[in-house]
């Protein structure tokens, strides 16, 4: 029988302990009377051990050790000892031996006394010290086999109690990041990089992020150091967004009034000086011509009509020189010019008339004739039973060097209510009507309009050589561009380098930071790809401004409005610039205005064609567009509409 | 708006005189030549001549020669078409077209038929 | 005199259909060819003047080619109003020569 815990406890006191040992002693002797020396019934073994449990737990075992060894009277030692052990149930040892402190022999039972970490009846079982409050550890408690200990997570370290845990400075090792930061962490660290730029564990630096690589860019990314650039193609109208990654469309900031007239003809339309109206005239009749028309422009120089037959034979060509009308005219193989009236480019309205007389030609201005020029012969020519005229507007049917005096035939102007021939025309009417290039813009101002669409190029010479023979040549680049732009983003001025395909120089309008990844509207001066200058400027205020460029050896400025920019590299930076800008200008450059030709959209911080009105001066020298190299046809040479007025 | 008027049909007898007329309006009838086209029924177009509205002067081309007369009254801005001793085989509309050395303005048509 | 070759004198075409009407002439005429159309109890039209021009108001679909004695003249596609007499007209020279004509029929 087993008692409860709390008695046993209790008869385990160390008093009673004493007197049960005492006792216990007193029993064997007993014992060894009555049931050893001789053979004991269970009242006499009852009387061994005054109480019932141990006479049950004995007696049965007793007659066990009777047929094992046979009688007490047989005097078998084996007998002697199996039944002395028999009271004592500490033998042999229940308990296990590896958990217990001590064996106590009960009555009919015994209590393994367990050392501490262990438990269980045969003190067999470890005690989990872990589960309880995690055995006073602060972090990680062990358990194991009759104890427990404590430990720290990676980072920290057991303190000298034995229990609690401290963290561990590993940035205190100076090898523990290699070239990056270090900062310590509860029970860590971290090898910090600057924004760019990633930790590299092997290599113990910090290494450059190619943002590239994530497509982060719409369309065209450059990876750098630290950092990234996104381009979108200028050229196609697109500009980066606010995100500075994706491309929007450059849309006009400022309405110009870009309202054209249907019933008007541009004779500027050309560039390659060819005429925008070719008529054939064929009459059975002989006739004379008649031509009237209004017209307008600003600009100084150009052919308005040629009238006659082939370069060799008879004709006449209307144009005009330093704003007044000159008339030059071959007759049978012989040449005239004459050059009379009053200044004609203001821009006004005026009313122009050719008249083939019988013995002269007439020119009138608003009806007032200017020039009255006596001619021998006929402008129509007879072949072959007819007569015939070629009539050709804004430009003449051959080359300009086979006229009389050489001319520039690109004419920036506009006629309306043309009459040829006293004829009603209605094929140059409809022809107009459904071409809106074709038509003038209603109304305009001075100056050059660009449509954000094309660009002009000349080939002009950067560099001066000095007077004094065997002097190194110097270069100088100085541009002024009176603008006033429609869109917020655009090339108002570029050197090309075409054999190496390079930007050497540009003066763009742009529309944020590159650099600090801040939208602003900005000037931006660059030698190839790299800005040397910014200025900020009010793009789309609709009014002029003035862009000023300047830059020769060991200097560049960039000045808008009269304000200087800021500097965007260091003097040695600037220095370097300058010089590969000097190589660029030694070989041959194209002079570009209002844009670029198909750059790679990296080659410059912009690509795009300007859009608005502007003038440009090179070397304080004006630049007209009709002496351009290359012009677009979009782009009017002498003339810009004006900014829409504001509705009401 | 430029407009040729010619005529109405005529029925003539062989032998006989025909005299049809043009009236131009809607530009200087001197500034341009007036031709004149014939068109036997079912038959393709035949050039005539024509008359310098300047100086009134005809021309013809050979085919019609002798009994066809162009004329002009400027007063009243009308060129005038007359054929003389009337065969069966001038039975045809007569066409008036304004010269620009091809021609853009016609007149309506004025049909002669020419029957015993 | 400049005689001009008109060919086919008749041809019997689908609405849609493609249709080229060829004009040769005895002498080089360089690009003095005229097209026109005409139709029952009307004057001609000139549909195309010297130098392959297309007049004003008239579709697109009527063009011409040529230069010198080989002249082209095409319908691109027949529509119902296109059904009528074609005639071309050389103004190089007096005196000035029509081709025999082409009759353009609903087939």
């Known amino acids: 029988a087993l008692l409860p815990a709390r008695e046993a406890t209790q008869f385990l006191r160390p008093r009673q302990r004493r007197a049960f040992q005492v006792f216990e002693e007193a029993k064997q002797g007993h014992l060894e009377r009555e049931c050893v020396e001789e053979l004991c019934s269970r009242e006499e073994a009852r009387e061994v051990f005054e109480n019932d449990p141990e006479t049950d737990y004995f007696y049965p075992r007793y007659l066990d050790c009777i047929n094992k060894y046979g009688s007490p009277y047989t005097k078998n030692s084996g007998f002697a000892t199996c039944v002395q052990n028999l009271p004592d149930q500490c033998t042999p040892n229940p308990c296990d031996r590896k958990g217990t402190q001590a064996c106590q022999d009960l009555m009919g039972n015994f209590f393994c006394l367990c050392k501490a970490g262990w438990g269980g009846r045969l003190c067999d079982k470890d005690v989990n010290e872990c589960s309880q409050e995690n055995g006073g550890c602060l972090q990680i408690c062990h358990n194991k086999p009759g104890s427990f200990h404590c430990s720290c997570h990676s980072g920290f370290e057991l303190s000298s109690d034995g229990r609690t845990c401290q963290d561990i400075d590993e940035c205190a090792d100076s090898e523990a990041c290699g070239e990056a930061r270090c900062k310590n962490l509860p029970g860590s660290y971290s090898c910090l990089c600057d924004e760019g730029f990633a930790y590299s564990s092997q290599e113990k630096a910090c290494r450059d992020v190619d943002e590239c690589l994530q497509g982060r860019c719409e369309q065209v990314c450059v990876n750098s150091p630290g950092s990234y650039t996104c381009h979108c193609d200028g050229r196609g109208g697109l500009k980066l967004s606010q995100d500075m990654d994706t491309c929007e469309d450059i849309l006009p900031c400022v309405p110009f009034s870009v309202a054209k007239s249907v019933k008007s003809l541009y004779l500027g339309r050309m560039f390659s000086g060819t005429p925008v109206i070719r008529l054939r005239f064929k009459r059975l009749q002989p006739t004379r011509l008649v031509a009237e028309f209004d017209f307008r422009t600003f600009d100084p120089e150009g052919i308005l009509l040629f009238a006659g037959g082939h370069q060799d034979s008879t004709w006449i060509v209307l144009a005009l020189r330093a704003g007044r009308l000159e008339l030059q005219l071959r007759y049978n193989g012989v040449g005239r010019v004459t050059s009379s009236g009053p200044v004609i480019n203001h821009g006004m309205w005026q009313t122009i008339s050719v008249e083939e007389l019988a013995r002269n030609l007439v020119i009138k201005v608003n009806r007032d004739a200017v020039m009255k020029i006596a001619v021998a012969g006929d402008l129509f020519q007879p072949e072959r039973g007819l007569y015939h005229l070629n009539l050709t507007v804004g430009g003449i049917p051959f080359h300009e060097k086979d006229l009389v005096q050489p001319i520039n035939p690109r004419l920036d102007g506009c006629m309306r209510s043309w009459n040829w021939l006293n004829g009603e025309d209605t094929t140059i009417q409809e022809t107009v009507k459904v071409n809106t290039r074709m038509q003038c813009f209603s109304v305009t101002e001075r100056g050059s309009f660009y449509p954000g669409s094309g660009f002009a190029f000349y080939s002009l010479d950067y560099m001066r050589t000095p007077l004094d023979v065997g002097t190194e040549s110097t270069w100088e680049v100085e541009v002024v561009a009176h603008i006033r732009p429609a869109a917020d983003t655009g090339v108002l001025f570029a050197l090309w380098a075409p054999d190496l395909r390079a930007v050497p120089l540009s003066v763009a309008l742009v529309d944020y930071h590159s650099t600090k990844k801040l939208k602003k509207q900005l000037v931006v001066l660059a030698v190839e790809h790299t800005a040397l200058a910014l200025m900020e400027i009010k793009v789309c205020d609709g009014q002029e401004h003035v862009v000023t460029v300047s830059l020769r050896d060991g200097e560049a400025t960039l000045e808008v409005d009269g304000t200087r920019g800021q500097s965007e590299v260091s003097a040695a930076q600037l220095q370097e610039r300058l010089a590969v800008l000097e190589r660029h200008l030694r070989s041959p450059v194209l002079t570009f205005a209002g844009g670029l030709p198909d750059v790679p959209v990296t080659s410059a911080p912009v690509t795009a064609f300007y859009r608005g009105c502007m003038t440009l001066e090179v070397n304080r020298r004006l630049l007209d567009l009709d002496e351009a190299a290359y012009k677009h046809s979009d782009i009017t040479a002498h003339s810009c509409p004006p900014v829409e007025p504001a509705a009401a | 708006q430029i407009h040729l008027v010619q005529s109405g049909p005529e029925l003539k007898k062989p032998g006989a005189s025909v005299k049809i007329s043009c009236k131009a309006s809607?530009?200087?009838?001197?500034?341009?030549?007036m031709n004149w086209v014939k068109q036997a029924p079912g038959q393709g177009l035949k050039w005539m001549g024509w008359?310098?509205?300047?100086?009134?002067?005809?021309t013809y081309t050979e085919e019609f020669k002798g009994r066809f007369v162009f004329s002009l009254d400027t007063s009243v801005t009308t060129a005038y078409l007359q054929i003389s001793t009337l065969k069966a085989e001038d039975t045809a509309t007569y066409f008036c077209?304004?010269?620009?050395?091809?021609?853009?303005?016609w007149g309506q048509g004025t049909l002669i038929t020419v029957s015993s | 005199e400049t005689t001009l070759t008109q060919s086919p004198s008749s041809l019997s075409v689908s609405t849609g259909d493609r249709v080229t009407i060829t004009c040769i002439t005895s002498?080089?005429?360089?690009?003095?060819m005229n097209w026109y159309q005409q139709k029952p109890g009307k004057p001609p039209k000139l549909l195309i003047s010297?130098?392959?021009t297309l007049r004003p108001g008239v579709p697109s679909r009527f063009s011409s080619s040529g230069s010198g004695t080989d002249f082209t003249f095409t319908i691109s596609s027949t529509q119902p109003e296109d059904f009528a007499d074609y005639y071309c007209?050389?103004?190089?020279?007096?005196?000035?020569?029509f081709g025999q004509g082409t009759k353009v029929e609903i087939k």
């Open positions: 077209a304004r010269d620009e050395g091809w021609f853009v303005y």
């Open positions: 809607g530009y200087t009838f001197t500034n341009y030549g």
């Open positions: 008359i310098n509205t300047n100086t009134g002067e005809p």
């Open positions: 002498t080089d005429i360089d690009d003095d």
């Open positions: 010297e130098g392959n």
């Open positions: 007209l050389q103004t190089d020279s007096v005196p000035l020569t």
